[in-house]
Amino acid sequence: TIPPHVQKSVNNDMIVTDNNGAVKFPQLCKFCDVRFSTCDNQKSCMSNCSITSICEKPQEVCVAVWRKNDENITLETVCHDPKLPYHDFILEDAASPKCIMKEKKKPGETFFMCSCSSDACNDNIIFSEEYNTSNPDLLLVIFQ
């Protein structure tokens, strides 16, 4: 996908539907490409990306890529078509409403990637599946 400031005209009259017959329209995703991040050793992080974009195509989903090497940590947020690999990996969790990070093997760095299909779902990246900010009990713990 291309970011909104260089988007080309798109005029595709085909209505895209999911497996249940529900209409799929372009979703909103955080879209800051690659930025330095302070997210490290946390169960979940916010992207700190202020740019929420309409994806170019209805089939695209939100993606987040977290990378750590000897020098820095980066977080990449984009829209991407799950039929196509991203960073040479298949987006296997594209239908998930949450962005649950999964580690991928990349030489010389720690590499996590997630994808998801609800609006701006790559704003909240989750490294631990049991961690869920929608859990009211957990919110009580946080705000006490």
């Epitope: 400031h5 999911d18 799929k24 329209f25 909103l28 309409i54 609800s118 609006d119």
Partner: antibody, heavy 116, light 107 residues
């Protein structure tokens, strides 16, 4: 087919309350940010507020003109968006549209008239 | 809040004319600018998003351009069904604000 159907518009006195509903169908409602936009008679469009998805905490944003008086909520099990309007003023008189945030899906609108 | 100013507020044109509407933001909004068309008694319809991307199903006579603070909606050859009110909206920051509208009338 995506459908958004608003209801609950009425004539109400200043200071009164009203709750609008928007029944959504034809798409995965729980995955979408949803907004309310209003239009006073003969005037332009004004964004009222939005509710984000429940998985992102269901947080809300409001226009300054309605903050503290209006509350937007959603019930994903019923595919329904709500707008609770309290302390209504005459300047809240408008057609209220339910929309999928920043996408081209709007309801037909429901008229709210605030008058004594 | 970001203020959006459209000009002109109204214009008269004939079928076949080239029509240009401008929208200015009070601060830079990159390319986060949408254009809507509204006909009397109807909900608005999205024409252009991200300043220049044509919404699915919208005729190619509509085009958008600009970035930063200055944006343009162009109708290359006005058709009878294009007589309506047009609104710009920024989606760069919350609240997403609309311009005051431009009414395109028949000359």
């Amino acid at each position: 087919e995506v459908q958004l159907v608003e209801s609950g518009g009425d004539l109400v006195k200043p200071g009164g309350s009203l709750r609008l509903s928007c029944a959504a169908s034809g798409f995965t409602f729980s995955n979408a940010w949803m907004s309310w936009v209003r239009q006073a008679p003969g005037k332009g469009l004004e964004w009222v507020g939005r509710v984000k998805t429940t998985v992102s905490g269901g947080t809300t944003d409001y226009a300054a003109a309605v903050k503290g008086r209006f509350t937007i909520s959603r019930d994903d099990s019923k595919n329904t968006l709500y707008l609770q309007m309290n302390s209504l003023k005459t300047e809240d008189t408008a057609i209220y549209y339910c929309t999928i945030d920043l996408r081209d899906y709007w309801g037909q609108g429901t008229l709210v008239t605030v008058s004594s | 809040d970001i203020q959006m100013t459209q000009s002109p507020s109204s214009l008269s044109a004939s079928v076949g004319d080239r029509v240009t509407i401008t929208c200015r933001a009070s601060q830079s909004i990159s390319s986060y600018l949408n254009w809507y068309q509204q006909k009397p008694g109807k909900a608005p319809k999205l024409l252009i998003y991200a300043a220049s991307s044509l919404q699915s199903g919208v005729p190619s006579r509509f085009s958008g351009s600009g970035s930063g603070t200055d944006f343009t909606l162009t109708i290359s050859s006005l058709q009878p069904e294009d007589f309506a009110t047009y609104y710009c909206q920024q989606s760069y920051s919350t609240p997403p604000t609309f311009g005051q509208g431009t009414k395109v009338e028949i000359k």
